[in-house]
Protein backbone atom coordinates (compact mmCIF):
# COMPACT_ATOMS: atom_id res chain seq x y z
CA UNK A 1 0.00 0.00 0.00
CA UNK A 2 1.42 3.34 -1.07
CA UNK A 3 1.60 6.20 1.44
CA UNK A 4 -0.81 8.98 0.51
CA UNK A 5 1.42 11.87 1.56
CA UNK A 6 5.07 12.80 1.65
CA UNK A 7 6.97 12.55 4.93
CA UNK A 8 6.43 15.61 7.16
CA UNK A 9 8.46 18.73 6.50
CA UNK A 10 10.49 19.85 9.50
CA UNK A 11 11.90 23.39 9.61
CA UNK A 12 15.66 23.51 8.94
CA UNK A 13 15.88 19.74 8.43
CA UNK A 14 16.06 17.19 5.63
CA UNK A 15 15.06 13.54 5.62
CA UNK A 16 16.60 10.44 4.10
CA UNK A 17 15.60 6.80 3.86
CA UNK A 18 18.48 4.50 4.73
CA UNK A 19 16.79 1.65 2.88
CA UNK A 20 13.62 1.36 0.81
CA UNK A 21 10.82 -1.13 1.45
CA UNK A 22 9.75 -3.49 -1.34
CA UNK A 23 7.03 -1.76 -3.35
CA UNK A 24 8.76 1.64 -3.25
CA UNK A 25 8.78 3.43 -6.60
CA UNK A 26 11.32 5.98 -7.80
CA UNK A 27 10.32 8.24 -10.69
CA UNK A 28 12.68 8.26 -13.66
CA UNK A 29 13.19 12.01 -13.81
CA UNK A 30 15.72 13.74 -16.06
CA UNK A 31 17.40 17.08 -15.64
CA UNK A 32 16.50 20.08 -17.77
CA UNK A 33 17.28 19.56 -21.43
CA UNK A 34 16.93 15.78 -21.16
CA UNK A 35 14.02 13.35 -21.25
CA UNK A 36 13.35 9.67 -20.67
CA UNK A 37 14.28 7.50 -23.64
CA UNK A 38 11.37 6.34 -25.76
CA UNK A 39 9.96 3.11 -24.33
CA UNK A 40 11.97 3.82 -21.18
CA UNK A 41 10.63 3.05 -17.73
CA UNK A 42 8.52 5.61 -15.92
CA UNK A 43 9.85 4.42 -12.59
CA UNK A 44 12.12 1.98 -10.82
CA UNK A 45 10.47 -0.50 -8.45
CA UNK A 46 11.97 -2.16 -5.39
CA UNK A 47 11.10 -5.84 -5.66
CA UNK A 48 12.46 -9.06 -4.23
CA UNK A 49 12.02 -12.38 -2.54
CA UNK A 50 12.76 -13.46 1.01
CA UNK A 51 16.52 -13.41 0.51
CA UNK A 52 17.22 -10.55 -1.89
CA UNK A 53 15.70 -7.24 -2.94
CA UNK A 54 16.67 -5.06 -5.89
CA UNK A 55 15.40 -2.31 -8.15
CA UNK A 56 13.49 -3.44 -11.26
CA UNK A 57 13.72 -1.35 -14.43
CA UNK A 58 16.46 1.14 -15.19
CA UNK A 59 16.08 4.87 -15.67
CA UNK A 60 17.69 6.31 -18.79
CA UNK A 61 17.77 9.89 -20.02
CA UNK A 62 18.56 11.25 -23.44
CA UNK A 63 19.09 14.76 -24.70
CA UNK A 64 15.87 16.43 -25.78
CA UNK A 65 17.69 17.44 -28.96
CA UNK A 66 18.79 13.94 -30.01
CA UNK A 67 17.28 10.49 -30.37
CA UNK A 68 20.38 8.66 -29.18
CA UNK A 69 20.05 6.92 -25.83
CA UNK A 70 22.67 7.46 -23.18
CA UNK A 71 24.40 4.79 -21.16
CA UNK A 72 24.24 4.77 -17.38
CA UNK A 73 27.18 6.35 -15.67
CA UNK A 74 27.85 7.77 -12.21
CA UNK A 75 27.60 11.57 -12.19
CA UNK A 76 30.60 13.76 -11.63
CA UNK A 77 31.36 14.61 -7.98
CA UNK A 78 30.06 18.15 -8.29
CA UNK A 79 26.86 16.87 -9.88
CA UNK A 80 26.43 14.35 -7.10
CA UNK A 81 26.86 17.04 -4.48
CA UNK A 82 23.77 18.93 -5.58
CA UNK A 83 21.48 15.91 -5.58
CA UNK A 84 19.28 15.81 -2.53
CA UNK A 85 19.54 12.08 -2.17
CA UNK A 86 23.26 11.64 -1.65
CA UNK A 87 24.07 9.99 1.67
CA UNK A 88 23.78 12.18 4.72
CA UNK A 89 27.13 12.21 6.47
CA UNK A 90 25.70 11.21 9.80
CA UNK A 91 27.72 10.41 12.90
CA UNK A 92 25.29 7.63 13.73
CA UNK A 93 23.50 6.01 10.83
CA UNK A 94 20.61 4.14 12.37
CA UNK A 95 20.36 1.33 9.83
CA UNK A 96 22.78 -0.76 7.81
CA UNK A 97 21.02 -0.81 4.46
CA UNK A 98 22.44 -4.15 3.43
CA UNK A 99 21.21 -5.90 6.55
CA UNK A 100 17.50 -5.15 6.20
CA UNK A 101 15.57 -7.98 4.52
CA UNK A 102 12.79 -6.83 2.23
CA UNK A 103 14.52 -3.53 1.54
CA UNK A 104 16.50 -2.09 -1.37
CA UNK A 105 19.58 0.11 -1.11
CA UNK A 106 19.72 3.63 -2.51
CA UNK A 107 19.62 3.15 -6.31
CA UNK A 108 22.81 4.21 -8.10
CA UNK A 109 22.59 7.49 -10.01
CA UNK A 110 21.97 7.51 -13.72
CA UNK A 111 23.36 9.88 -16.28
CA UNK A 112 21.56 13.23 -16.54
CA UNK A 113 19.28 12.38 -13.63
CA UNK A 114 17.20 15.22 -12.18
CA UNK A 115 18.69 16.93 -9.12
CA UNK A 116 15.84 15.79 -6.88
CA UNK A 117 14.55 12.24 -6.58
CA UNK A 118 10.84 11.62 -6.22
CA UNK A 119 10.01 8.46 -4.29
CA UNK A 120 6.61 6.88 -3.71
CA UNK A 121 6.88 5.22 -0.31
CA UNK A 122 4.91 2.28 1.04
CA UNK A 123 3.41 1.62 4.47
CA UNK A 124 6.12 0.69 6.95
CA UNK A 125 8.77 2.92 5.36
CA UNK A 126 10.98 4.77 7.83
CA UNK A 127 12.85 7.99 7.07
CA UNK A 128 15.42 9.77 9.24
CA UNK A 129 15.82 13.51 9.70
CA UNK A 130 18.84 15.68 10.34
CA UNK A 131 19.37 19.40 10.78
CA UNK A 132 20.66 21.31 7.77
CA UNK A 133 24.01 23.04 7.89
CA UNK A 134 24.08 25.95 10.33
CA UNK A 135 21.44 24.41 12.60
CA UNK A 136 21.78 22.05 15.53
CA UNK A 137 19.40 19.68 17.23
CA UNK A 138 18.02 20.44 20.64
CA UNK A 139 17.84 16.76 21.54
CA UNK A 140 20.00 13.73 20.90
CA UNK A 141 19.10 10.46 19.13
CA UNK A 142 17.68 9.78 15.66
CA UNK A 143 14.57 11.62 14.55
CA UNK A 144 12.46 9.34 12.49
CA UNK A 145 9.08 9.19 10.80
CA UNK A 146 7.23 6.02 9.83
CA UNK A 147 4.41 5.66 7.34
CA UNK A 148 1.60 3.87 9.18
CA UNK A 149 -1.85 2.64 8.24
CA UNK A 150 -4.56 3.59 10.71
CA UNK A 151 -8.30 3.23 10.17
CA UNK A 152 -7.74 2.52 6.49
CA UNK A 153 -5.73 5.72 5.94
CA UNK A 154 -1.99 6.21 5.76
CA UNK A 155 -0.14 8.81 7.82
CA UNK A 156 3.43 9.64 8.75
CA UNK A 157 4.37 9.87 12.41
CA UNK A 158 5.79 13.21 13.55
CA UNK A 159 9.56 13.12 14.08
CA UNK A 160 9.52 16.17 16.37
CA UNK A 161 13.01 17.30 15.52
CA UNK A 162 13.83 20.83 16.64
CA UNK A 163 16.74 22.42 14.78
CA UNK A 164 17.92 25.68 16.28
CA UNK A 165 20.01 28.33 14.55
CA UNK A 166 23.42 29.32 15.81
CA UNK A 167 22.85 33.06 15.65
CA UNK A 168 23.24 33.71 19.35
CA UNK A 169 26.40 33.14 21.34
CA UNK A 170 25.76 30.76 24.18
CA UNK A 171 28.21 32.32 26.64
CA UNK A 172 27.91 35.35 28.82
CA UNK A 173 31.07 36.79 30.35
CA UNK A 174 32.15 34.60 33.21
CA UNK A 175 29.82 31.77 32.24
CA UNK A 176 31.25 28.29 32.50
CA UNK A 177 32.10 26.38 29.33
CA UNK A 178 29.44 23.93 28.16
CA UNK A 179 29.87 20.42 29.45
CA UNK A 180 29.53 17.53 27.03
CA UNK A 181 27.22 14.69 27.88
CA UNK A 182 28.85 11.60 29.40
CA UNK A 183 28.09 9.50 26.34
CA UNK A 184 29.91 11.97 24.15
CA UNK A 185 28.30 14.07 21.48
CA UNK A 186 28.04 13.45 17.74
CA UNK A 187 31.23 14.28 15.89
CA UNK A 188 29.68 16.68 13.43
CA UNK A 189 27.36 19.39 14.67
CA UNK A 190 26.01 20.07 11.21
CA UNK A 191 24.77 16.54 10.68
CA UNK A 192 22.74 16.02 13.77
CA UNK A 193 20.67 12.94 13.11
CA UNK A 194 19.19 13.52 16.45
CA UNK A 195 16.12 14.05 18.44
CA UNK A 196 13.20 12.80 20.00
CA UNK A 197 10.56 15.02 20.35
CA UNK A 198 9.63 18.46 20.04
CA UNK A 199 7.50 18.03 22.96
CA UNK A 200 7.86 14.34 23.59
CA UNK A 201 10.38 12.64 25.72
CA UNK A 202 10.19 8.83 25.69
CA UNK A 203 10.84 6.00 28.04
CA UNK A 204 14.42 4.74 28.10
CA UNK A 205 15.45 2.73 25.09
CA UNK A 206 18.37 0.53 24.22
CA UNK A 207 21.50 2.51 23.43
CA UNK A 208 21.69 0.79 20.06
CA UNK A 209 18.63 2.68 18.87
CA UNK A 210 18.55 6.03 20.57
CA UNK A 211 15.10 7.29 19.88
CA UNK A 212 12.91 9.68 21.76
CA UNK A 213 11.62 9.42 25.29
CA UNK A 214 7.90 9.21 24.96
CA UNK A 215 7.08 8.68 21.33
CA UNK A 216 6.48 5.02 21.82
CA UNK A 217 4.06 5.76 24.58
CA UNK A 218 2.33 8.53 22.68
CA UNK A 219 2.00 7.09 19.21
Amino acid sequence: ELCDDDPPEIPHATFKAMAYKEGTMLNCECKRGFRRIKSGSLYMLCTGNSSHSSWDNQCQCTSSATRNTTKQVTPQPEEQKERKTTEMQSPMQPVDQASLPGHCREPPPWENEATERIYHFVVGQMVYYQCVQGYRALHRGPAESVCKMTHGKTRWTQPQLICTGEMETSQFPGEEKPQASPEGRPESETSCLVTTTDFQIQTEMAATMETSIFTTEYQ
Partner: antibody, heavy 114, light 111 residues
Protein backbone atom coordinates in the same frame (compact mmCIF):
# COMPACT_ATOMS: atom_id res chain seq x y z
CA UNK B 1 8.33 7.35 35.75
CA UNK B 2 9.63 10.74 34.65
CA UNK B 3 10.22 13.12 37.54
CA UNK B 4 11.49 16.70 37.66
CA UNK B 5 11.99 18.27 41.06
CA UNK B 6 12.82 21.97 41.40
CA UNK B 7 14.43 23.55 44.44
CA UNK B 8 16.16 26.79 45.44
CA UNK B 9 13.24 29.21 45.34
CA UNK B 10 12.50 31.67 48.10
CA UNK B 11 12.28 35.31 49.08
CA UNK B 12 15.05 37.61 47.86
CA UNK B 13 15.53 41.37 47.75
CA UNK B 14 15.69 43.30 44.46
CA UNK B 15 19.21 43.13 43.06
CA UNK B 16 19.83 39.84 44.84
CA UNK B 17 20.66 36.40 43.45
CA UNK B 18 19.23 32.88 43.61
CA UNK B 19 20.23 29.56 42.08
CA UNK B 20 17.48 27.14 41.12
CA UNK B 21 18.12 23.42 40.66
CA UNK B 22 16.08 20.74 38.94
CA UNK B 23 16.79 17.07 39.66
CA UNK B 24 15.66 14.77 36.82
CA UNK B 25 14.96 11.04 36.90
CA UNK B 26 13.11 8.39 34.88
CA UNK B 27 14.65 9.24 31.50
CA UNK B 28 18.05 9.67 29.87
CA UNK B 29 18.60 13.27 30.92
CA UNK B 30 21.66 13.78 28.72
CA UNK B 31 19.62 13.23 25.55
CA UNK B 32 17.18 16.08 25.98
CA UNK B 33 17.05 19.83 25.72
CA UNK B 34 15.81 21.35 28.98
CA UNK B 35 13.89 24.53 29.75
CA UNK B 36 12.97 26.92 32.46
CA UNK B 37 9.47 28.37 32.13
CA UNK B 38 7.93 30.76 34.64
CA UNK B 39 4.46 31.88 35.63
CA UNK B 40 3.86 35.11 37.51
CA UNK B 41 0.97 35.04 40.00
CA UNK B 42 -2.34 35.01 38.10
CA UNK B 43 -0.55 35.27 34.72
CA UNK B 44 0.27 32.99 31.81
CA UNK B 45 3.32 30.88 31.00
CA UNK B 46 6.52 32.64 29.94
CA UNK B 47 9.52 30.78 28.52
CA UNK B 48 12.77 31.80 30.22
CA UNK B 49 15.64 29.75 28.79
CA UNK B 50 16.63 26.55 26.99
CA UNK B 51 19.82 24.49 26.97
CA UNK B 52 20.67 21.79 24.43
CA UNK B 53 21.17 18.16 25.38
CA UNK B 54 24.94 18.54 25.77
CA UNK B 55 25.02 22.09 27.08
CA UNK B 56 26.72 23.37 23.94
CA UNK B 57 24.22 26.15 23.29
CA UNK B 58 21.76 28.17 25.32
CA UNK B 59 19.09 30.72 24.56
CA UNK B 60 17.31 33.22 26.77
CA UNK B 61 14.16 35.32 26.67
CA UNK B 62 14.94 39.03 26.21
CA UNK B 63 13.51 39.79 29.64
CA UNK B 64 16.28 37.79 31.40
CA UNK B 65 19.16 38.04 28.96
CA UNK B 66 22.39 39.08 30.67
CA UNK B 67 21.00 38.39 34.15
CA UNK B 68 20.13 34.68 34.11
CA UNK B 69 22.38 31.75 33.22
CA UNK B 70 21.17 28.24 32.42
CA UNK B 71 23.49 25.26 32.84
CA UNK B 72 23.34 21.50 33.31
CA UNK B 73 25.39 18.71 34.81
CA UNK B 74 24.61 15.54 32.89
CA UNK B 75 26.63 13.42 35.32
CA UNK B 76 24.25 14.53 38.10
CA UNK B 77 21.06 14.64 35.98
CA UNK B 78 20.56 18.21 37.15
CA UNK B 79 19.53 21.46 35.47
CA UNK B 80 20.37 24.87 36.98
CA UNK B 81 19.26 28.48 36.64
CA UNK B 82 21.51 31.15 38.14
CA UNK B 83 19.47 34.32 38.60
CA UNK B 84 21.29 37.59 39.26
CA UNK B 85 20.13 41.21 39.51
CA UNK B 86 16.64 40.05 40.38
CA UNK B 87 13.73 42.42 39.90
CA UNK B 88 10.20 42.51 41.30
CA UNK B 89 8.88 41.42 37.90
CA UNK B 90 10.86 38.17 38.16
CA UNK B 91 8.49 37.05 40.92
CA UNK B 92 6.93 33.81 39.64
CA UNK B 93 6.70 30.06 39.97
CA UNK B 94 9.65 28.65 38.00
CA UNK B 95 9.11 25.34 36.26
CA UNK B 96 11.81 23.06 34.95
CA UNK B 97 10.61 21.26 31.80
CA UNK B 98 12.00 18.49 29.62
CA UNK B 99 11.69 18.26 25.85
CA UNK B 100 10.24 21.46 24.55
CA UNK B 101 8.48 21.00 27.00
CA UNK B 102 6.25 18.02 27.64
CA UNK B 103 7.17 17.01 31.16
CA UNK B 104 7.17 19.62 33.88
CA UNK B 105 8.20 19.78 37.50
CA UNK B 106 5.81 21.08 40.13
CA UNK B 107 7.62 24.42 40.23
CA UNK B 108 9.43 26.51 42.84
CA UNK B 109 8.26 29.98 43.91
CA UNK B 110 10.66 32.91 43.61
CA UNK B 111 9.54 36.11 45.33
CA UNK B 112 11.52 39.30 44.74
CA UNK B 113 10.49 41.93 47.27
CA UNK B 114 12.00 44.40 49.70
CA UNK C 1 2.10 40.41 25.36
CA UNK C 2 2.12 36.79 24.21
CA UNK C 3 3.50 35.81 20.81
CA UNK C 4 0.62 33.36 20.23
CA UNK C 5 -2.86 34.82 20.56
CA UNK C 6 -5.65 33.00 22.40
CA UNK C 7 -9.04 34.22 23.59
CA UNK C 8 -8.79 34.99 27.31
CA UNK C 9 -11.92 33.01 28.15
CA UNK C 10 -14.30 30.39 26.84
CA UNK C 11 -17.30 28.66 28.33
CA UNK C 12 -19.81 25.92 27.71
CA UNK C 13 -22.33 23.71 29.39
CA UNK C 14 -21.76 20.04 30.17
CA UNK C 15 -21.97 17.92 27.02
CA UNK C 16 -21.31 20.86 24.71
CA UNK C 17 -18.42 21.22 22.26
CA UNK C 18 -16.00 24.12 22.81
CA UNK C 19 -13.21 25.34 20.53
CA UNK C 20 -10.19 27.44 21.54
CA UNK C 21 -8.16 29.19 18.85
CA UNK C 22 -4.45 29.98 18.76
CA UNK C 23 -2.98 32.39 16.22
CA UNK C 24 0.73 32.70 15.52
CA UNK C 25 3.00 34.08 12.83
CA UNK C 26 5.46 33.10 10.12
CA UNK C 27 8.24 32.55 12.67
CA UNK C 28 6.38 29.91 14.67
CA UNK C 29 3.21 28.12 13.55
CA UNK C 30 3.51 29.45 10.01
CA UNK C 31 7.14 28.28 9.79
CA UNK C 32 5.92 24.69 10.01
CA UNK C 33 6.41 24.06 13.71
CA UNK C 34 4.00 21.80 15.50
CA UNK C 35 1.48 23.23 17.92
CA UNK C 36 1.10 21.72 21.37
CA UNK C 37 -1.63 22.25 23.92
CA UNK C 38 -1.43 22.21 27.72
CA UNK C 39 -4.06 21.96 30.40
CA UNK C 40 -3.35 23.64 33.73
CA UNK C 41 -5.70 22.79 36.55
CA UNK C 42 -5.81 25.31 39.42
CA UNK C 43 -2.68 25.14 41.59
CA UNK C 44 -0.91 22.53 39.47
CA UNK C 45 1.82 22.42 36.82
CA UNK C 46 0.86 22.41 33.13
CA UNK C 47 0.18 19.00 31.61
CA UNK C 48 0.64 18.09 27.95
CA UNK C 49 -2.79 17.59 26.39
CA UNK C 50 -2.16 17.55 22.63
CA UNK C 51 1.20 17.31 20.87
CA UNK C 52 2.15 17.67 17.22
CA UNK C 53 -1.04 19.52 16.29
CA UNK C 54 -3.44 16.61 16.79
CA UNK C 55 -1.83 13.75 18.72
CA UNK C 56 -2.98 12.73 22.20
CA UNK C 57 -0.62 11.38 24.87
CA UNK C 58 -1.79 8.15 26.43
CA UNK C 59 -4.38 8.79 29.10
CA UNK C 60 -5.85 11.87 27.41
CA UNK C 61 -9.49 11.18 26.42
CA UNK C 62 -10.45 11.38 22.75
CA UNK C 63 -12.85 14.19 23.62
CA UNK C 64 -9.79 16.42 23.16
CA UNK C 65 -8.58 17.04 19.61
CA UNK C 66 -6.35 19.54 17.86
CA UNK C 67 -5.88 20.89 14.36
CA UNK C 68 -3.55 23.29 12.59
CA UNK C 69 -3.83 25.33 9.40
CA UNK C 70 -1.46 28.01 8.16
CA UNK C 71 -0.52 30.27 11.07
CA UNK C 72 -3.37 29.13 13.31
CA UNK C 73 -4.36 26.14 15.38
CA UNK C 74 -7.33 25.14 17.48
CA UNK C 75 -8.21 22.86 20.36
CA UNK C 76 -11.64 21.25 20.43
CA UNK C 77 -13.22 19.73 23.52
CA UNK C 78 -16.39 17.75 22.94
CA UNK C 79 -18.72 16.33 25.56
CA UNK C 80 -17.63 19.02 28.00
CA UNK C 81 -17.30 17.95 31.64
CA UNK C 82 -16.96 19.90 34.86
CA UNK C 83 -13.41 18.54 35.37
CA UNK C 84 -12.36 20.24 32.09
CA UNK C 85 -12.55 23.61 33.85
CA UNK C 86 -8.94 24.82 33.64
CA UNK C 87 -6.55 27.13 31.81
CA UNK C 88 -5.49 25.98 28.34
CA UNK C 89 -2.28 27.12 26.65
CA UNK C 90 -1.02 26.61 23.11
CA UNK C 91 2.71 26.59 22.34
CA UNK C 92 5.03 26.27 19.37
CA UNK C 93 8.72 26.68 18.68
CA UNK C 94 9.70 30.12 17.41
CA UNK C 95 12.63 30.75 15.07
CA UNK C 96 13.19 34.33 16.13
CA UNK C 97 13.32 33.38 19.79
CA UNK C 98 15.06 30.01 19.49
CA UNK C 99 12.65 28.75 22.08
CA UNK C 100 9.01 27.87 22.54
CA UNK C 101 6.38 30.59 22.63
CA UNK C 102 3.14 30.30 24.54
CA UNK C 103 -0.31 31.70 24.07
CA UNK C 104 -1.67 33.93 26.81
CA UNK C 105 -3.94 31.14 27.98
CA UNK C 106 -7.69 30.58 27.81
CA UNK C 107 -9.70 30.12 30.99
CA UNK C 108 -12.41 27.55 30.30
CA UNK C 109 -15.51 27.72 32.48
CA UNK C 110 -18.02 24.89 32.54
CA UNK C 111 -21.37 26.50 33.31
Amino acid sequence: EVQLLESGGGLVQPGGSLRLSCAASGFTFSWYGMHWVRQAPGKGLEWVSVISYDGSYKYYADSVKGRFTISRDNSKNTLYLQMNSLRAEDTAVYYCAAGVPDYWGQGTLVTVSS
Amino acid sequence: QSVLTQPPSASGTPGQRVTISCTGSSSNIGAGYDVHWYQQLPGTAPKLLIYSNNERPSGVPDRFSGSKSGTSASLAISGLRSEDEADYYCAAWDDSLNGPVFGGGTKLTVL
